[in-house]
Amino acid sequence: MAVTACQGLGFVVSLIGIAGIIAATCMDQWSTQDLYNNPVTAVFNYQGLWRSCVRESSGFTECRGYFTLLGLPAMLQAVRALMIVGIVLGAIGLLVSIFALKCIRIGSMEDSAKANMTLTSGIMFIVSGLCAIAGVSVFANMLVTNFWMSTANMYTGMGGMVQTVQTRYTFGAALFVGWVAGGLTLIGGVMMCIACRGLAPEETNYKAVSYHASGHSVAYKPGGFKASTGFGSNTKNKKIYDGGARTEDEVQSYPSKHDYV
C-alpha cells in the first residue's frame, strides 16, 4: 500500500513538475526590465526564450520573436536545448510511468517489469528536473553577467555617440516557475526510484533446514538466505552461503517421519 502511494505521489509530483517546465519554457517573463521612464510614460520590457515584449504604461504591448537575430547570446540556445531536453525526457518518463503504475493492470505484466519501468521513469524525471534547473540557472547567470558587462559601457559608433543606459532588471516569473518545477520533477523522480525498490518482487531462497531425530546423529543445517530486488536474481539453485554446512543436494539424508523441510 505504501509503495503504491509512493509511486502514485511520485507520478503526480512529476506530472505537476513537467507541466511547470513546459509552462516556464513557453513563458515570456524570463527577465523583466524598465527600458524607458519619463514623467508621462514608462516602457517595460519582458523577455522569454522565444520572444521579447514591450509594454507601456499607456497599455500598448508589442511582442517580437527573435527569429534569426545574430546578436542573441549563444547561451540562449543552450538554455532552449536544456529546457526542451527536460520536457522530452519528462514526457517519455510520464508515458513509461503510466504503464508502471501498480494500480493499473495491463495484461499479465509482472511486478519485476513494473519495477524496471518505475526505475526508468524515475531516472528520466530526475534527469528532466536537473535539465530544467540547469537551464534556468544558466539563464539567470547569463542575465546577471550580461547586465554587468553592458553597464556604463560607452563607445563611439558610426551614427555618433552610443551609450548604454543603466536600467533596472529583475528575474522574471518564469525563472522561479522553472526552478520550482525542476525541483518537483526531481523529487517525483526520487519518489519513483524509492517506489521501485518496494515494487520489485522479493525473491527468497531458503535452504533446507533438516532436523534428523533418527538415531544419535542429529544434523542441523543453517541455510543461506537471499532477499532479491529482481535485478540479477538468483534464479538457479546456486549455493549462496552455507556457513560450513552442506545443502540437501550435497549430503545424503535418510528418510524419516521426523524429517522437516
Partner: nanobody, 120 residues
Framework: EVQLVESGGGLVQPGGSLRLSCAAS????????MEWYRQAPGKGRELVAT???????YYADSMKGRSTISRDNAKNTVYLQMNSLKPEDTAVYYC??????????????WGQGTLVTVSS
C-alpha cells in the same frame, strides 16, 4: 550597429516653422523610444520631446504647445515639427534612439546633430 541621419535644420526667421527628421538604419532588434534633444551654445544638452514605440509623447516645458513629435515605425523615423520659433530656440538639435538589446542593457544611439538658427 545603428546609424542616425538627421535633416531639416537651417536658418529660420522668428515666428517661423521647421520640421526636423531623423532616420535610423542598420541592424537592431527594436527601437523603444525616439527623442529630440538640443544644445544651445555654452549650455548643456536638454530634452525637447520624446515618443515611445506605442506613440506616447512627452514634451519639455520649453517647447510645450509649440512642437509636435511623431514617428513612422515602419521607416524607423522620428519627426519634430517646431512652430512659433524664437531666437532662444537656436541650438544644435540631436536625435536619440533607445534600442532594445535582448538580455542586455538597452543602447542609446545619438545622431551627429543638425543646427537650427532662429534669426531675423
Amino acid at each position: 550597429e545603428v546609424q542616425l541621419v538627421e535633416s531639416g535644420g537651417g536658418l529660420v526667421q522668428p515666428g517661423g516653422s521647421l520640421r526636423l527628421s531623423c532616420a535610423a538604419s542598420g541592424s537592431f532588434f527594436r527601437i523603444v523610444a525616439m527623442e529630440w534633444y538640443r544644445q544651445a551654445p555654452g549650455k548643456g544638452r536638454e530634452l525637447v520631446a520624446t515618443i515611445t514605440r506605442g506613440g506616447s509623447t512627452y514634451y519639455a516645458d520649453s517647447m510645450k504647445g509649440r512642437s509636435t513629435i511623431s514617428r513612422d515605425n515602419a521607416k524607423n523615423t522620428v519627426y519634430l515639427q517646431m512652430n512659433s520659433l524664437k531666437p532662444e530656440d537656436t541650438a544644435v538639435y540631436y536625435c536619440n534612439v533607445r534600442v532594445e538589446v535582448p538580455f542586455m542593457q538597452p543602447n542609446d544611439y545619438w545622431g551627429q546633430g543638425t543646427l537650427v538658427t532662429v534669426s531675423s
